[in-house]
């Protein structure tokens, strides 16, 4: 149904509070360097304009598309060019080119200081002074650092943040109350940000078909009792919602997400019995609850997959008549039977099945050709299973820090051209997957590991695209979304890499390392480790172990010494010489 004024329609649907929050997120995600006050001013102007349109939908400019209204607002900022440089060139373009231009200037890695959490007392004082402004500031700070954060979910986290402060600021021990709550919100929000970033990358880099396939697999796992037609309906709506949010159309996205949640609650009998507990919640919690929903139980007595996809004589006919529907049905049927598989695995299996049919359906006897297709797809299941088992064994043996070190060595050998801080950051992130997933039961380990790896590798790919340094990384990132992880796993020592000349200053330490927090101490040591691998990419595991052992002993000795700096100055060069000899 067409509305005279789109902005009035969204204001009415969303309500003033959510409307203002979404406008603030939109501005903060696009104008990441602007101060909070400037955004607040623009938010108030946009809100006043929307209210005027609610009063009279025929009023001047009320009929304009929301994206055009936002673009006009941004382009009217006097300091736009001096703050944002070439982003101002977008203003010379007409919509929709202008919108695309703004999107291309979103910075996934803005040069902003880390979002530090003030002391509980200071937090509570600021919150009590003006809690709307305080929550607005939270939305602003998160949005500018995460320009693709799923906006309606961010409103949910802001609500959680507000609730935590409301409760804990009245507590006797504010810190004891707040710290675990805010840590949990932060951790969940960071995962949510990475998940949405992967969805946007999937749509933007690999197209709608890739995103729809991902969604069919995920929803079929969660709602195995729903019919394929029902899953397809939800996927179509979900694709629209995701496209809108990824495109920066946050008011439309949030409104359509509400509609999707409403639809799912109205049709819960044909989707999942687990929806009941979500559907009684208010708007934001309802949609969040659906997003995080526990999977439903598998229907009993599902027929063997081979019946419809191998034994049936109509396979090639069905494939020819409606390729995407037939493959979608295969993905649905396979996914609902395998909640323990990762999305990547399911999509690789579907891709393998498709490739087999492409080949076999062109033969004179297709059935003879594809009769053993499931046996041939087995390696796609065995490879990640084996990999997870091996890595979790290594994790159990070494612990998180040791495991991170092993990964730092491994990934530096794969892509030594990548900067040392980046390699350390990703080794640490990859290592933390062990902590998250290896303690889980066997049935959840596999999907946990691969699904997390997909998020981490996506971030690596996005940042690498901005400043490419390794052809191998580019290849793994761009060739196929579902094969990213296997592609990185398959990389070994880069034979084309010319080892970095030895620089003693990369391995020179001072007494200040002794007083650093444990995490920062680890990072420093891991930086040295990566530098070492860049210097000797083909060093054996034994050599690396020896060097790391000597290094740890040196740090312990000097940090325990009375005159720490003298110890570092004297023993440092000896250690460097010893390490060079070990690696010679």
């Amino acid at each position: 149904e067409a509305h005279k004024s789109e902005i009035a329609h969204r204001f009415n649907d969303l309500g003033e509070g959510h409307f203002k929050g979404l406008v603030l997120i939109t501005l903060s995600q696009h104008l990441q360097k602007s101060p909070f006050e400037e955004h607040v001013k623009l938010v108030n102007e946009v809100t006043d304009f929307a209210k005027a349109c609610v009063a009279d939908e025929s009023a001047q400019n009320c009929g304009k598309a929301i994206a055009t209204l936002f673009g006009d607002k941004v382009c009217a900022i006097p300091s736009l060019r001096e703050t944002y440089g070439e982003l101002a060139d977008c203003c010379a373009k007409e919509d929709p080119d202008r919108v695309e231009c703004f999107l291309q200037h979103k910075d996934d890695n803005p040069n902003l200081p880390p979002f530090e959490r003030p002391e509980p007392e200071a937090l509570c004082t600021a919150f009590k002074e003006n809690n709307d402004r305080f929550i607005g500031h939270y939305l602003y700070e998160v949005s500018r650092r995460h320009p693709y954060f799923y906006a309606p979910e961010l409103l949910y986290y802001a609500e959680k943040y507000k609730n935590a402060l409301t409760e804990c600021c009245e507590a006797a021990d504010k810190a004891a109350c707040l710290t675990p709550k805010l840590d949990a919100i932060k951790e969940k929000a960071l995962v949510s940000s990475a998940q949405q970033r992967l969805k946007c990358a999937s749509l933007q880099k690999f197209g709608e078909r890739a995103f729809k396939a991902w969604s069919v697999a995920r929803l079929s796992q969660k709602f195995p009792k729903a019919e394929f037609a029902e899953i397809s309906t939800i996927v179509t709506s979900l694709t629209k919602v995701t496209k809108e949010c990824c495109h920066g159309d946050l008011l439309e996205c949030a409104d359509d997400r509400q509609e999707l949640a409403k639809y799912m609650c109205e049709h819960q009998d044909s989707i999942s019995s687990k929806l009941k507990e979500c559907c009684v919640k208010p708007t934001l919690q309802k949609a969040h609850c659906i997003l995080e929903i526990q999977r439903d139980e598998l229907p009993t007595e599902l027929p063997d997959l081979a019946v419809d996809f191998v034994e049936d004589k109509e396979v090639c006919k069905n494939f020819a008549e409606a390729k995407d529907v037939f493959l979608g049905t295969f993905l649905y049927e396979y996914s609902r039977r395998h909640p323990e598989y990762s999305i990547g695995m399911l999509l690789r299996i579907a891709k393998g099945y498709e490739a087999k049919l492409e080949k076999c359906c062109a033969e004179a006897d297709p059935h003879a050709c594809y009769a053993k297709v499931f046996d041939e797809l087995q390696p796609l299941i065995d490879e990640p299973k084996k990999l997870v088992q091996q890595n979790c064994e290594l994790f159990d043996k070494l612990g998180e820090y040791g495991f991170q070190n092993a990964l730092a060595v491994r990934y530096t050998q794969k892509a030594p051209q990548v900067s040392t801080p980046t390699l350390v950051e990703y080794a640490r992130k990859l290592g933390s997957v062990g902590t998250k997933c290896c303690s889980l039961p066997e049935t959840e380990r596999l999907s946990c590991t691969e699904n997390y790896l997909a998020l981490i590798l996506n971030r690596l790919c996005i940042l690498h695209e901005k400043t490419p340094v390794s052809e191998r990384v580019t290849k793994c990132c761009t060739e196929s979304l579902v094969n990213r992880r296997p592609c990185f796993s398959a990389l070994h020592v880069d034979e084309t890499y010319v080892p970095k000349p030895f620089h003693a200053d990369s391995f020179t330490f001072h007494a200040d390392i002794c007083t650093l927090p444990e995490k920062e101490k680890q990072v420093k040591k891991q930086m040295a480790l990566v530098e070492l691998v860049k210097h000797k990419p083909k060093a054996s595991e034994e050599q690396m172990k020896t060097v790391m052992g000597d290094f740890a002993a040196f740090l312990k000795k000097c940090c325990d010494a009375d005159n720490k700096e003298a110890c570092f100055t004297e023993d440092g060069p000896k250690l460097v010489a010893k390490c060079q000899a070990t690696l010679a």
């Epitope: 109509e314 006919k317 020819a320 359906c361 033969e363 004179a364």
Partner: nanobody, 115 residues
Framework: EVQLVESGGGVVQPGGSLRLSCAAS????????MSWVRQAPGKGPEWVSS????????LYADSVKGRFTISRDNSKNTLYLQMNSLRPEDTALYYC????????SSQGTLVTVSS
């Protein structure tokens, strides 16, 4: 939408010949193996012959081997069945299918062999 339209059937005396055609549309014809299937009155479908997408591989039921020849012209999206030395037991409705399918999704063309 996939469409298969058969033609070339008719009444022929035993020992005679006919050439059936099947015009295909709505899918990538050259990417799919094709088959001819027949159904005699009051009987179930019987597979007759198959050909690969490129036309390099062919298969025949024992009952027609040496008498029937399957071929295709990918530039015209058309499948053919040359039937020689026809016998009364070849009387049936003939239809073309994609891959190894036996189910009929087209009109078919009737072949009657009778003196």
């Amino acid at each position: 939408e996939v469409q298969l339209v058969e033609s070339g059937g008719g009444v022929v005396q035993p020992g005679g010949s006919l050439r059936l055609s099947c015009a295909a549309s709505g899918f990538t014809f050259r990417s799919f193996g094709m088959s001819w299937v027949r159904q005699a009155p009051g009987k179930g479908p019987e597979w007759v012959s198959s050909i690969s997408g490129s036309g390099s591989d062919t298969l025949y039921a024992d009952s027609v081997k040496g008498r029937f020849t399957i071929s295709r012209d990918n530039s015209k999206n058309t499948l053919y069945l040359q039937m020689n030395s026809l016998r009364p037991e070849d009387t049936a409705l003939y239809y073309c299918t994609i891959g190894g399918s036996l189910s009929r999704s087209s009109q078919g063309t009737l072949v009657t062999v009778s003196s």
